[in-house]
Interface confidence: low
């Protein structure tokens, strides 16, 4: 019968011929009376056999990631009679892995959005690298992830590539961060190969800023001839938030005379001071009122940022009109 062990050849061998093993018949007594032949895909081009001894050699550099096994056939013939000594037999040559592929991030570029002020531990995104080496061959394809840029705001779980928040971030200070992640194979041991990827993390706005008046005092004038409903001026607050979180409502906090009102222009986010009752210079030539401003939408959990609404004082001078 046929005698052989399992055949392995390491990939990427630079030698011109690499001895893989021997294929022989147990009837072969070593007197060179038998001829061994190799058949199948790769026979003669990738692999050759010593026809006298049955020794098999690889004569080409092999790439396991391209092809991991070869199925060949062997024959042994008695030179004297030309007849087969053994039935033709199929055998396998396996290409064994070396760590010749670096981890690659295939889904680049990565981008994620996370609300500002998210608590530590909040999951941002998972990045995944793949390694073309053999996962069953030692640690060649076992990856460890680490953070090259992004501390102290982000952390990465070494074995999963899950990026989490490790420190609260304020969108109003910085609204996007670039995080650089490295994946290393061989679980970081000597000879490891690495790949990097970048993740753009954008902070979405939450309503963590209340509107604040630009001025602590506004001076307006109104003619005593002005009819009710007249707009006598505008006041303005600013809010560091954006979009819906910066929408605001103005209102009167104090107006003993109940002469004025404030309406909100939701296009410009300005407060418009309106005359509610006619004024008379001879009766009262100036007024002092207090206005306040609040955000339109404040979720319950963010109310802590909105205690004590911003207020401003408005001095209104009445202009005299000559009366007939």
């Amino acid at each position: 019968g046929w005698v052989w062990n399992q055949f392995f050849v390491p990939e990427e061998m630079n030698t011109t011929s690499h001895h893989i093993g021997q294929l022989r018949s147990d009837l072969d007594n070593g007197n060179n009376s038998f001829q061994y032949k190799l058949l199948g895909a790769g026979a003669g081009s990738t692999f050759i056999i010593d026809e006298r001894t049955g020794d098999i050699y690889a004569i080409q550099k092999l790439d396991r990631e391209e092809r991991s096994l070869y199925i060949l056939r062997a024959q042994v013939i008695d030179i004297a009679t030309g007849r087969a000594v053994e039935p033709e037999s199929e055998f396998v040559i396996k290409v064994s892995d070396i760590n010749d592929n670096e981890p690659k991030f295939l889904d680049e570029p990565y981008e994620a959005i996370v609300p500002e002020m998210s608590p530590e531990g909040t999951l941002v995104i998972q990045v995944t690298a793949s390694d073309a080496d053999d996962p069953s061959s030692g640690n060649n394809a076992r990856l460890l992830y680490s953070l090259l840029q992004g501390q102290p705001y982000f952390s990465v779980e070494p074995t999963t590539g899950v990026i989490r928040i490790s420190s609260k971030m304020d969108r109003e200070l910085q609204d996007e961060y670039w995080v650089i992640i490295q994946a290393k194979d061989m679980i970081g041991q000597p000879g490891a190969l690495s790949g990097t990827t970048s993740v753009l993390i954008k902070l979405s706005d939450v309503n963590d800023n209340k509107p604040i008046f630009k001025e602590s005092l506004y001076r307006l004038t109104v003619s005593e001839s002005a009819p009710t409903g007249t707009s006598i001026g505008t006041i303005m607050a600013y809010d560091n938030d954006i979009g819906e979180n910066a929408e605001m409502d103005y209102s009167i906090e104090e107006d003993d005379s109940q002469t004025f009102d404030i309406i909100t222009n939701h296009e410009t986010q300005e407060g418009i001071v309106i005359l509610k009752k006619k004024v008379d210079f001879e009766h009262q030539n100036h007024y002092g009122i207090r206005a306040k401003v609040k955000n339109h939408h404040v979720p319950e959990q963010l109310m802590k940022y909105h205690t004590e609404a911003s207020t401003t004082f408005i001095k209104i001078q009445v202009e005299d009109v000559d009366e007939p």
Partner: antibody, heavy 116, light 111 residues
Framework: QVQLQESGPGLVKPSETLSLTCTVS????????WSWIRQPPGKGLEWIGY???????NYNPSLKSRVTISLDTSKNQFSLKLSSVTAADTAVYYC??????????WGQGTLVTVSS | QSVLTQPPSVSGAPGQRVTISCTGS?????????VHWYQQLPGTAPKLLIH???NRPSGVPDRFSGSKSGTSASLAITGLQAEDEADYYC???????????FGGGTRLTVL
């Protein structure tokens, strides 16, 4: 307004080590990356390397074996050391702040000449 | 040899429109990394002109605009003025180098 100012010797002898410091004012060195970039006379810009305020560094592969960038947060400064210099290292050296993947603030630059 | 390729020079008369191209590869612009543009007036440090392909920092006139497509990007300047005469550099990030790369620069001459 963030301002950056390079300082260091303008003349370095061949085979010696070039040392430059960048002082950041008008803002904290914390929570950003900071880069060194150079420009040989009459030529284009070349990124040398950066340091993140946590201390992580990344260098241009062509200069990696000779470059060290370090940080002194207490002084709001970061520094460049380039060893074994030759005439080819003669350039204007700029420090800059990385914002995302571009450079939004630059120093005015300092010319370093390598000559014996 | 720069990783990003720019024409060495362009020119135009006052009031005209000029464009400067910047060609990269699959490891930088083609991967999806943004392109940024800098203006360097004679004897001064580079100044950020366009970031994130097409965004102008405050103070940069709207005569300057940027765009990106595939593995290349371009900077357009309309209504050319004498003070636009300068060197212009494109810049991106390269994943194979794990670092920032610049174009070789383009000198703009206003005729």
């Amino acid at each position: 307004q963030v301002q950056l100012q390079e300082s260091g010797p303008g003349l370095v002898k061949p085979s010696e080590t070039l040392s430059l410091t960048c002082t950041v004012s008008g803002g904290s060195i914390s929570s950003y990356s900071w880069s060194w970039i150079r420009q040989p006379p009459g030529k284009g810009l070349e990124w040398i390397g950066y340091i993140y305020y946590s201390g992580s560094t990344n260098y241009n592969p062509s200069l990696k074996s000779r470059v060290t960038i370090s940080l002194d947060t207490s002084k709001n400064q970061f520094s460049l050391k380039l060893s074994s210099v030759t005439a080819a290292d003669t350039a204007v050296y700029y420090c800059a702040r990385n914002w995302a993947f571009h450079f939004d603030y630059w120093g005015q630059g300092t010319l370093v000449t390598v000559s014996s | 040899q720069s990783v990003l390729t720019q024409p060495p020079s362009v020119s135009g008369a006052p009031g005209q429109r000029v464009t400067i191209s910047c060609t990269g590869s699959s490891s930088n612009i083609g991967t999806g990394y943004d392109v940024h543009w800098y203006q360097q007036l004679p004897g001064t440090a580079p100044k950020l002109l366009i970031h994130g392909n097409s965004n102008r920092p405050s103070g940069v006139p709207d005569r300057f605009s940027g765009s990106k497509s595939g593995t290349s990007a371009s900077l357009a300047i309309t209504g050319l003025q004498a003070e636009d005469e300068a060197d212009y550099y494109c810049q991106s990030y390269d994943s194979s180098l794990s670092g920032w790369v610049f174009g070789g620069g383009t000198r703009l001459t206003v005729l």
